[in-house]
């Protein structure tokens, strides 16, 4: 079967109430079939490519475990399994200041060096 291209699927927006939790869905496809090398998953806020990171985790070669390296205020937790092309993120204890746009990103290293980031992101509305 032909190799898939890089793509990312995120909903335009997610709404939740302050104090509650929200899930920011993000799934992706990539052209590197059977890739099991080092992987980094990143979420950033504000703007793509340059906004501040709110979450980052890394998985070693051959591992499904994405070890959290950054979780802003300890409120961000990966629900999705990046090895299954899912970067869905849970945000706990929402505050009005969390009302912004979020962008997911995945990076491959090792034998393959490639990366991709959602351009439009998902808008989190906190009411």
């Amino acid at each position: 079967s032909p190799a898939q291209r890089w793509s990312m699927q995120v909903p335009p927006e997610v709404s939740a109430e302050a104090g509650d939790a929200a899930v920011l869905p993000c799934t992706f496809t990539h052209p590197h079939r059977h890739y099991d090398g080092p992987l980094t998953a990143i979420w950033r806020a504000g703007e793509p490519y340059a906004g501040p990171q709110v979450f980052r985790c890394a998985a070693a070669r051959g591992s499904e475990l994405c070890q959290t390296a950054l979780s802003l205020h300890g409120r961000f937790r990966l629900l999705g399994n990046p090895r299954r092309n899912d970067l869905s993120l849970r945000v706990e204890r929402l505050a009005l200041a969390d009302d912004r746009r979020y962008f997911c990103r995945v990076e491959f290293a090792g034998d393959v060096h490639d990366r991709y980031e959602s351009r439009h992101g998902v808008r989190l509305h906190v009411t």
């Epitope: 059977h34 070693a60 070890q67 629900l79 399994n81």
Partner: antibody, heavy 121, light 107 residues
Framework: QVQLVQSGAEVKKPGASVKVSCKAS????????VSWVRQAPGQGLEWMGV????????GYNEKFKARATITADTSTSTAYMELSSLRSEDTAVYYC??????????????WGQGTLVTVSS | DIVMTQSPDSLAVSLGERATINCKAS??????VDWYQQKPGQPPKLLIY???NRYTGVPDRFSGSGSGTDFTLTISSLQAEDVAVYYC?????????FGQGTKVEIK
């Protein structure tokens, strides 16, 4: 051949801790994730958490995060799962399982024989 | 957490007949479902991974299908040694979660 051999049955009192071991052989231990899964008598399977022995990184089911500690000793190819503040509902068979992979697919391909932990006053 | 609901809870099938077990996920889990067989006093044993892939050494009477939220394990011609409890498990989201199990017996 790949083998996971677990420690023997334990009887513990409520409030105590238990530490179950899982000795791996037949493969390169640091390369593969090891998960812990438990099964209460007559019940289904419940994933507790995982360790990547090569990095020592761990991930937990939130349900067990406060009470479970998963570790690994690469020098002896052994994974451990310690569960604290035991209660009667923790009576179960505890399994370790290797997360094998093939062409980018992951699965539990080898399991320990199980360790029965009984919590009773 | 993702809830995996199997149906039926138990199933009695004549030798040589087809057995079908369903598993429904509470949300889309792609094709990331495995099936395990467990016999009394033994650990689970992998049958099917990634919804449709038969694991090494598993007889071809076992097959899996489905994606999204609905998955099926089929035993095309039940043998005596297939009496066991069967579990589906999703690995798309953490924590990994299992179905409650389906007990397969001989009618």
């Amino acid at each position: 051949q790949v083998q996971l051999v677990q420690s023997g049955a334990e009887v513990k009192k409520p409030g105590a801790s238990v530490k179950v071991s899982c000795k791996a052989s037949g493969y390169t231990f640091p390369r593969y994730d090891v998960s812990w899964v438990r099964q209460a008598p007559g019940q289904g399977l419940e994933w507790m958490g995982v360790i990547h022995p090569g990095s020592g990184g761990t991930g937990y089911n939130e349900k067990f995060k406060a009470r479970a500690t998963i570790t690994a000793d690469t020098s002896t190819s052994t994974a451990y799962m310690e569960l604290s503040s035991l209660r009667s509902e923790d009576t179960a068979v505890y399994y370790c399982a290797r997360r094998g992979l093939n062409k980018g697919y992951w699965f539990f391909d080898f399991w320990g024989q199980g360790t029965l932990v009984t919590v009773s006053s | 957490d993702i809830v995996m609901t199997q149906s039926p809870d138990s199933l009695a099938v004549s030798l040589g007949e087809r057995a079908t077990i369903n598993c429904k996920a509470s949300q889309n889990v792609g094709s990331n479902v495995d099936w395990y067989q467990q016999k009394p006093g033994q650990p689970p044993k992998l049958l099917i991974y990634e919804s449709t892939n038969r694991y090494t050494g598993v007889p071809d009477r076992f097959s899996g299908s489905g994606s999204g939220t609905d998955f099926t394990l089929t035993i095309s011609s039940l043998q005596a040694e297939d009496v066991a409890v069967y579990y589906c498990m999703q690995s798309n989201f953490f924590p990994f979660t299992f179905g409650q199990g389906t007990k397969v017996e001989i009618k």
